[in-house]
């Protein structure tokens, strides 16, 4: 069971730069609540000297990245997936996560999110061209196939508890963080609140309950006067720079 499983947490705000992604620090190991079985690819490996970072889904990558196989046709047939730089507007896409913040995937192309045109939650039909080179693609012949999907597009900022894809989807003072098997808008941490210190280089993975990063002018540091026998269990809080 999960009692003995360690899942690596990923930094939400900043991640190391795989193939041109945003810079920052990846995660430290955290344990997950008992009573649930978690099955995920190779998330428990530590890849200290390995760049770019492997992933199983978009949520494990930074806000300017998405998870995919670097070579066409490899995904879905056991190919290694890594965090790739997001695609800018007018580039080909299969799903929203492939497009850079401020854009969404419409008709297989990354388009700018136009707040004036779509109310929150408007549902729009998108024809997605599936080239078989992404982890959502079916394993098989590598021939192009077209799939009609329906895209739920949010054009107002998410409030606390709203489902999100990246922090730019959330209102001010909130970030997009993992909760259970989804990602939701959670409050950015205030001074004195417990934070997760991401210190092990390259231990890039998944955490079932993610905290946001510390707010403006704050850093996640070991709490003063908090000395414990185990280095790894020291309490970190958001503190003034």
């Amino acid at each position: 069971t999960l009692n003995s499983v360690l899942i690596n947490s990923n930094a939400i705000k900043n991640l190391p730069p795989p193939l041109g992604g945003a810079g920052g620090q990846p995660g430290s190991a955290v344990s997950v609540a008992p009573g649930v079985l978690y099955e995920g690819g190779n998330k428990y490996q530590t890849l200290d000297n390995y760049q770019p970072y492997p992933c199983a889904e978009d949520e494990e990558c930074g806000s300017d990245e998405y998870c995919s196989s670097p070579s066409r046709g490899a995904a879905g047939v056991g190919g290694v997936q890594i965090c790739l730089a997001c695609r800018k507007r007018r580039k080909r896409c299969m799903r929203h996560a492939m497009c850079c913040p401020g854009n969404y995937c419409k008709n297989g192309i990354c388009m700018p999110s136009d707040h004036s045109h779509f109310p929150r939650g408007e549902i729009e039909e998108s024809i997605i061209e599936n080239l078989g080179n992404d982890h959502n693609a079916a394993a098989g012949d590598g021939y192009p196939r077209r799939t009609t999907l329906t895209s739920k597009i949010y054009h107002t900022k998410g409030q606390e508890g709203s489902v999100c894809l990246r922090s730019s989807d959330c209102a001010a003072g909130l970030c997009c963080a993992r909760h259970f098997w989804s990602k939701i808008c959670k409050p950015v941490l205030k001074e004195g609140q417990v934070c997760t210190k991401h210190k092990r280089k390259g231990s890039h993975g998944l955490e079932i309950f993610q905290r946001c990063y510390c707010g403006e002018g704050l850093a996640c540091r070991i709490q003063k006067d908090h000395h414990q026998a185990s280095n790894s269990s020291r309490l970190h809080t958001c503190q003034r720079h």
Epitope: V32, E57, R95, K152, L165, F180, W181, I184, P187, I208
Partner: antibody
Framework: EVKLVESGGGLVKPGGSLKLSCAAS????????MSWVRQTPEKRLEWVAS???????YYPDSVKGRFTISRDNVRNILYLQMSSLRSEDTAMYYC???????????WGQGTSITVSS | DIVLTQSPASLAVSLGQRATISCRAS??????????MNWFQQKPGQPPKLLIY???KQGSGVPARFRGSGSGSDFSLTIHPVEEDDTAMYFC?????????FGGGTKLEIK
């Protein structure tokens, strides 16, 4: 319109197997986590399994090793493969998802399973 | 697991009056600045419908008559004024910890 339609329920003997399906439409299926929740004849609701958009799976102790949740992101179908079924698995099985907020805000109509000899 | 205890198990309220259902958790369901408590309504032969999430936020298309309140481990759902159509089972559910758990339900009848 968001639609979740379950199928595959029926009568099965203890120790038997069954595979449930949930056909999803009206949203980008691959972007969202999906779950199975069951309701016992006594009307008690129980979480059964969940799967993230990328395919990571989660189970409670009561079903792990017996049930397997999976998804087909091309055909937009969620599955629940159930084996070693017990009488206490008798329930209405619903598939559900969280599209707008973290809670399960969309549910299918359910499919009924009876485990009895 | 977090145990949710709902009370009363059933209640009958006159049309136009106030119905209050309570849900107590075995431990706090607050985390990350959010109370992870939800309320569902279920009518006979139908799936549960989300009414309230994050203790007090209304789900899509839910009338303002349904109000959620509380934090920590004590929560309540208030329906006012009660309408004929509100006859149903009401469940609380926590999403703070895995496994997510549900209360035993409260049956509301309209007099």
């Amino acid at each position: 319109e968001v639609k979740l339609v379950e199928s595959g329920g029926g009568l099965v003997k203890p120790g038997g197997s069954l595979k449930l399906s949930c056909a999803a439409s009206g949203f980008t299926f691959s972007n969202y986590a999906m779950s199975w929740v069951r309701q016992t004849p006594e009307k008690r609701l129980e979480w059964v399994a969940s799967i993230s958009g990328g395919g990571d799976t989660y189970y409670p102790d009561s079903v792990k090793g017996r049930f397997t949740i999976s998804r087909d992101n091309v055909r937009n179908i969620l599955y629940l493969q159930m084996s070693s079924l017990r009488s206490e698995d008798t329930a209405m099985y619903y598939c559900a998802t969280s599209l707008e907020n973290y809670a399960m805000d969309y549910w299918g109509q359910g499919t009924s399973i009876t485990v009895s000899s | 697991d977090i145990v949710l205890t709902q009370s009363p198990a059933s209640l009958a309220v006159s049309l136009g009056q106030r119905a209050t259902i309570s849900c107590r958790a075995s431990e706090s369901v607050d985390d990350f600045g959010i109370s992870f408590m939800n309320w569902f309504q279920q009518k006979p032969g139908q799936p549960p419908k989300l009414l309230i999430y994050a203790a007090s936020k209304q789900g899509s298309g839910v009338p303002a008559r349904f109000r959620g309140s509380g934090s920590g481990s004590d929560f309540s759902l208030t329906i006012h004024p009660v309408e004929e159509d509100d006859t149903a089972m009401y469940f609380c559910q926590q999403s703070k910890e895995v496994p997510p758990t549900f209360g035993g339900g409260t049956k509301l009848e309209i007099k």
